[in-house]
């Protein structure tokens, strides 16, 4: 763009240098050249000479008119054709911008990822504005009435150290640019209600060699939250439909979940958790791929063992002893057997 230019005259824009996209725009050029009575005044947009809709107003001034200007940015300059000069003489230049006032920020969400030390707030900014738009996040304590303000673009991370004076806050986002200002709806936040447990990870899976083979999936989390509700979704890599199991988890122990799956098939597993009774979920864990073993001997595959048949939900605890060459320490492992149902509206879909 034209940031600094020594003008021999003036250039101005109506309605202004930043205007709403699609508006009609007039750009004026007024020369103040010494020793020049210009034959012609010329306009250039982004370096290209304009041919149409130019009006010479008087000896020193000309105007170019644009109907429905819709370019986000343009670099305008004007020149004079001075008698006796081989080249045109520069008069002045301006950067112009068109855009939109901001939409009201929507879908404002604030969460605290366990151990992160931050409250992360995100929102939808709406349609592009094409011009510099600031987002101001207001965080107001409902107990002390004090307000903090943060500059952001589409999300903000606020240190929980700065939120120690209170547990309850009102959060809203203000979108501001030179064409307008809009506020999001206010979000009531209780810091204890927005914690998302530390990431859940599937560590391994194995398929037993039983008469009816079962697949055991092992998974864990470093969360310190006692009551956690989780979902594990799974499907063959060739399938589009997920099945989901739901269960309560206690991460004092490694979790063990049992599945009766099709033999000789490649399955994808993902898990996510939330604090029981709260609304914010972890993102789905990284996809874990497991190949079930081949069917041994000829056996009719029982319909109840299909992953897509509804099964009764049940959580059991299983005590297992370590192998004989290890110290005889008993370890409690949680095993789950329960209903499968197709999942819909999930993110991070695989295959």
């Amino acid at each position: 763009g034209i940031t600094s230019i020594n003008c021999s005259g003036d250039m101005w824009v109506e309605p202004g240098e930043i205007f709403q996209m699609g508006m009609n725009v007039s750009i004026y050029c007024q020369e103040a050249l010494k020793h020049c009575r210009p034959r012609n005044l010329y306009f250039y947009k982004n370096g290209f000479k304009e041919e149409f809709d130019i009006t010479r107003i008087n000896r020193t001034t000309a105007r170019i008119w644009y109907k429905g200007f819709s370019e986000p940015h343009a670099y305008m300059h004007c020149t004079a054709e001075c008698p006796g000069h081989f080249q045109e003489t520069l008069i002045c230049g301006k950067d112009i911008s068109s855009g939109h006032p901001p939409d009201a920020p929507s879908n404002l969400t604030c969460v605290i990822y366990e151990y992160s030390g931050n409250m992360t707030c995100t929102w939808n900014t709406g349609k592009p504005t094409y011009i510099d738009t600031k987002y101001i996040v207001h965080v107001k304590s409902l107990e002390t009435e004090e307000e903090q303000q943060y500059l952001a673009s589409s999300y903000v991370k606020i240190s929980t150290d700065s939120l120690q004076g209170s547990r309850k806050y009102l959060v809203w986002v203000q979108a501001v640019n030179s064409l307008g200002m809009e506020n999001s709806q206010q979000l009531h936040v209780h810091l204890d209600d927005i914690v998302i447990p530390s990431a859940s990870i599937i560590s391994r899976a194995e398929t037993t060699n039983d008469t009816v083979p079962k697949t055991i999936v092992y998974w864990k989390s470093k969360t310190m939250i006692e009551k956690v509700f989780c979902e594990m979704r799974y499907k063959t890599t060739t399938n589009q439909t997920w099945s989901v199991k739901e269960f309560d988890a206690n991460f004092t122990y490694v979790q063990q979940s049992e599945f009766y799956l099709e033999p000789d098939s490649k399955y994808v597993f993902q898990v996510r958790c939330q604090e029981t009774g709260k609304r914010n979920w972890q993102p789905w864990s990284s996809p874990f791929v497991h190949q079930t073993s081949q069917e041994t001997g000829k056996r009719n595959w029982q319909p109840w063992s299909s992953p897509f048949v509804h099964q009764t939900s049940q959580t059991v605890s299983q005590v297992t002893a370590k192998s004989s060459h290890e110290p005889q320490k008993m370890e409690m492992l949680s095993a789950t057997i329960f209903r499968g149902h197709p999942a819909s509206g999930n993110h991070q879909d695989i295959g």
Partner: nanobody, 118 residues
């Protein structure tokens, strides 16, 4: 109640430097967003620089690269270091709570006069 007191203004030659201070009380300064605004003779209030609650700074195009805003939370004081001053920086400078946009800032001080002249 919020109290703001600006100081550090004066007469300086073009190209010179000044450091403005704003002593504050009556609110939690360390977690508050703050702004410097100025009023040139015969003109309205214009924002100069802002610092948000997390320490992110922002500057008006006209002062970018020349002015620096900072906070000393231990002293509850806001600063504006002004270098390479120009005659067009002549104005009364005010500090304010809040950020520069969206009618969020409030000022209570008397301001400090900065005059840049040769």
């Amino acid at each position: 109640q919020v109290q703001l007191q600006e100081s550090g203004g004066g007469l300086v030659q073009p190209g010179g430097s000044l450091r403005l201070s704003c002593a504050t009380s009556g609110f939690t300064f360390s977690s508050s967003a703050m702004t410097w605004v100025r009023q040139a003779p015969g003109k309205g209030l214009d924002w100069v620089s802002g610092i948000d609650s997390g320490g992110t700074t922002v500057y008006a195009d006209s002062v970018k690269g020349r002015f620096t805003i900072s906070k000393d939370n231990a002293k509850n004081t806001l600063y504006l270091q002004m270098n390479s001053l120009k005659t067009e920086d002549t104005a009364v400078y005010y500090c304010a709570t809040g950020l520069p946009w969206g009618n969020t800032w409030r000022t209570t001080g008397q301001g400090t006069q900065v005059t840049v002249s040769s």
